[in-house]
Amino acid sequence: QGQDRHMIRMRQLIDIVDQLKNYVNDLVPEFLPAPEDVETNCEWSAFSCFQKAQLKSANTGNNERIINVSIKKLKRKPPSTNAGRRQKHRLTCPSCDSYEKKPPKEFLERFKSLLQKMIHQHLSSRTHGSEDSSGTTNTVAAYNLTWKSTNFKTILEWEPKPVNQVYTVQISTKSGDWKSKCFYTTDTECDLTDEIVKDVKQTYLARVFSYPAGNVESTGSAGEPLYENSPEFTPYLETNLGQPTIQSFEQVGTKVNVTVEDERTLVRRNNTFLSLRDVFGKDLIYTLYYWKSSSSGKKTAKTNTNEFLIDVDKGENYCFSVQAVIPSRTVNRKSTDSPVECMGQEKGEFRENWVNVISDLKKIEDLIQSMHIDATLYTESDVHPSCKVTAMKCFLLELQVISLESGDASIHDTVENLIILANNSLSSNGNVTESGCKECEELEEKNIKEFLQSFVHIVQMFINTS
Amino acid sequence: IPPHVQKSVNNDMIVTDNNGAVKFPQLCKFCDVRFSTCDNQKSCMSNCSITSICEKPQEVCVAVWRKNDENITLETVCHDPKLPYHDFILEDAASPKCIMKEKKKPGETFFMCSCSSDECNDNIIFSEEYNTSNPDGGGGSGGGGSGGGGSIPPHVQKSVNNDMIVTDNNGAVKFPQLCKFCDVRFSTCDNQKSCMSNCSITSICEKPQEVCVAVWRKNDENITLETVCHDPKLPYHDFILEDAASPKCIMKEKKKPGETFFMCSCSSDECNDNIIFSEEYNTSNPDITCPPPMSVEHADIWVKSYSLYSRERYICNSGFKRKAGTSSLTECVLNKATNVAHWTTPSLKCIR
């Protein structure tokens, strides 16, 4: 290929901009941020402003489809080669909103001139040692930086898996200094819990630097290593609520007191770990779902402590499940439901079987944590109730792969026990024939963690209906 | 198996091919459906001026030629070979050239081809002489260059720590070690042949002479795992690091009253991430390797390491899937009786 793909992509973009200029009268005449005379090292930031702008077809005439396709192509991510990203990234580039706003015609002209400038830069950088002796690019910037956080345990994940490169992560608050973590790692995740728990109400920003594996001192052509910024993250507002657990229930006459375990977090105060309630206070509420073991009709109650006191009918056994909620949030408001706990469980033998299956799964999860099993397993992550038996059989089959690959006696025994429990409960339903369900091999392959999470979800479906 | 042609990186998504080589998105002609003058020729050029970077790394190039009473069209696109296109499976997706095959479509003549070298759907070949069973290696864009899929990357080098230049026994400059360094943490590692440290902090040891150390302790209350850098000239926990030159961290029990205490040290990067308890691990003979692994029907394997305790995976060939409940894993293990290493038999079945 005479020209590299970065050039092809940039040239394509110029062609698309030119094509859109022909349809400028069919675009919504909205004023859009249009960077001009972009300062050096802020070209990629300006480029992303052009890509993010809400350029829209005015939905008139026959050109709507071609316009929409062109706009879609404009918004496709360019190849993030070092030639593109190996500029001195700065945190001080202007925000998109601060650029002058222009109607579509000028917007497109300015976009084109930025693209031309970037092509020129790219060509000149190729003659300035941006490639190593074998002709391959040194490093690629990290991308898809994602915060994964539950009950404040916070991990930054990114892509790609490194090929001849290593990463270092930095984190800071908006006003604070950068702190380096996970030095020169080949992992694509970094546990930043220690940093964010210092003040969970602060907003944090992280960045991932890429270095050539053979020489971490070597940097991009502008004298700094490539890096990519994460989205901002405010733990108090964004950490996911972990699955709650029912600690106990106690019946006195026609009242039952249900207590939710106060989950410990990794947030410290005066050298002690705070519970979820300590951190969130009255911002955290729990919703209790409860129903008679003999029926499916659910009732619900709420509390802003960790205790519920509910009325029940005498002589009836009830099942309980709780969900944590933070009403003041607009997203990530709810946790997943807790495992179901039932009164007098000997009466609901199959429900108890399923509850035991969940505890076996938790045991397997704990046991494999310290093993390196990289298998991917067929996983039904969105089980339709009419296919739950078929899906369960796939989960049980694939569980045997974990048993095989761990070579661990206690995992083997736990898996064997779990399969017996599950098969007992499945056979209690008689031979259910489900039609139109996916074969195991048609399912997506997921890593073990996701497989086990989905397994727990399907077991909960059985608990809720057994 | 030749490594998949490597292209410069599109960071949208990184996928690896059967050999574990990074598979970058394909460059294909992408003009969708256009009228064409291509007729009664052994081969045609697409006359499509748009080269597109396929959105997903697994996508290949496709060309569809159709002729009816009114006109001839040529369609050029990227498409995922796992999914049918125009109701047909892309059987030839791995081919480097786009060799047209006729498909049955009522009311029209319909040819389709797919291929996986850059812009390979620019030149579409109808000629029956073209030997599809043995396509030549040319055409498309050459893979060229070093670092093809199967080559084992060189050991990670580290930058010089200028505080102190140290050389090894051969006079070569010795760079500081990379080790897991989480100090003491609670652990779930128990009764296992080997464990991962679950320490996410990789540290560059302060001094070039330092090695990686792991300490596993169990008492009535809990289990801990300690990971650090340490200078082997100095004792650690009152014990000399006798195994500091070992590339792997092989645990040895030490006498400590009131607890079970294991310690190991090693001098390859992050070697204290994987701690090995298994006595079968033959420390006296670290050079034992496995022969090439056995073949499994409808599957390939690309071995990254033949050394003892390597774990490798077979991958089902295109059009086949791993049968649920079967494992693609094979492990290089030692037969104690013969002291010969062999690969374990995977339970893998590949089905259509």
Partner: antibody
């Protein structure tokens, strides 16, 4: 901005069924329960039940069990209420509303269902 | 089930008056109570949540108080647009019952 838009009024014969829809926009649909409330002519508000789009759990008032069935389509952020075996006393305005756990902060415009032979 | 008894059922007042409506729960509901206003032919509108908190965009002349079983809702100085029907609702446990409503009319 946050909106709940309900389907138009319906006139049904006794014994028939009706499905009322409530399309949500401007917020994360699965993060909030959807409540259904009935108001008979000249009367007060009666709680029918709610559905949690996150986990599919439904809670009904005893008086509406077997009468109302609540469902959601997450892909279109739409909640549905089906009323079966309609009788003249089911003639009412039916509201959907968003539950913020401590109250119902946004309401649909209401759907009038008339049951008449 | 928890019964909510609202009083009075109707009330006549003049612009500028201070009016109070009460709501009594048949068992303790902590502060899980909301107040709504409804005008004829319109949907209800949230005024107060968690017994005492003013909803977004609601004028400060509206206030709520109480916890446990006894709750009250006050309009400190009636405005012409305040003449409507007011409802309390407990959101503590299902079924989430409403009071029967208080119709506020112009004297």
């Amino acid at each position: 901005q946050i909106q709940l838009v309900q389907s138009g009024g319906e006139v049904k014969k006794p014994g028939a069924s009706v499905r009322v829809s409530c399309k949500a926009s401007g917020y994360s649909f699965t993060d909030y329960n959807v409540y259904w409330v009935r108001q008979s002519p000249g009367k007060g508000l009666e709680w029918i039940g709610y559905i949690d789009p996150y986990n599919g759990i439904t809670i009904y008032d005893q008086n509406f069990k077997g009468k109302a069935t609540l469902t959601v389509d997450k892909s279109t952020s739409t909640a549905y209420m089906e009323l079966s075996s309609l009788r003249s006393e089911d003639t009412a305005v039916y509201f959907c509303a968003r539950d913020v756990t401590t109250a119902l902060d946004f309401w649909g415009q209401g759907t009038t269902v008339t049951v008449s032979s | 089930d928890i019964q909510m008894t609202q009083s009075p059922a109707s009330l006549s007042a003049s612009v500028g008056d201070r009016v109070t409506i009460t709501c009594l729960a048949s068992q303790t509901i902590d502060t899980w109570l909301a107040w709504y206003l409804q005008k004829p032919g319109k949907s209800p509108q949230l005024l107060i949540y968690a017994a005492t908190n003013l909803a977004d965009g609601v004028p400060s002349r509206f206030s709520g108080s109480g916890s446990g079983t006894d709750f009250s809702f006050t309009i400190s100085s009636l405005q012409p647009e305040d003449f409507a029907t007011y409802y309390c609702q407990q959101v503590y446990s299902s079924p989430f019952t409403f009071g029967q409503g208080t119709k506020l009319e112009i004297k």
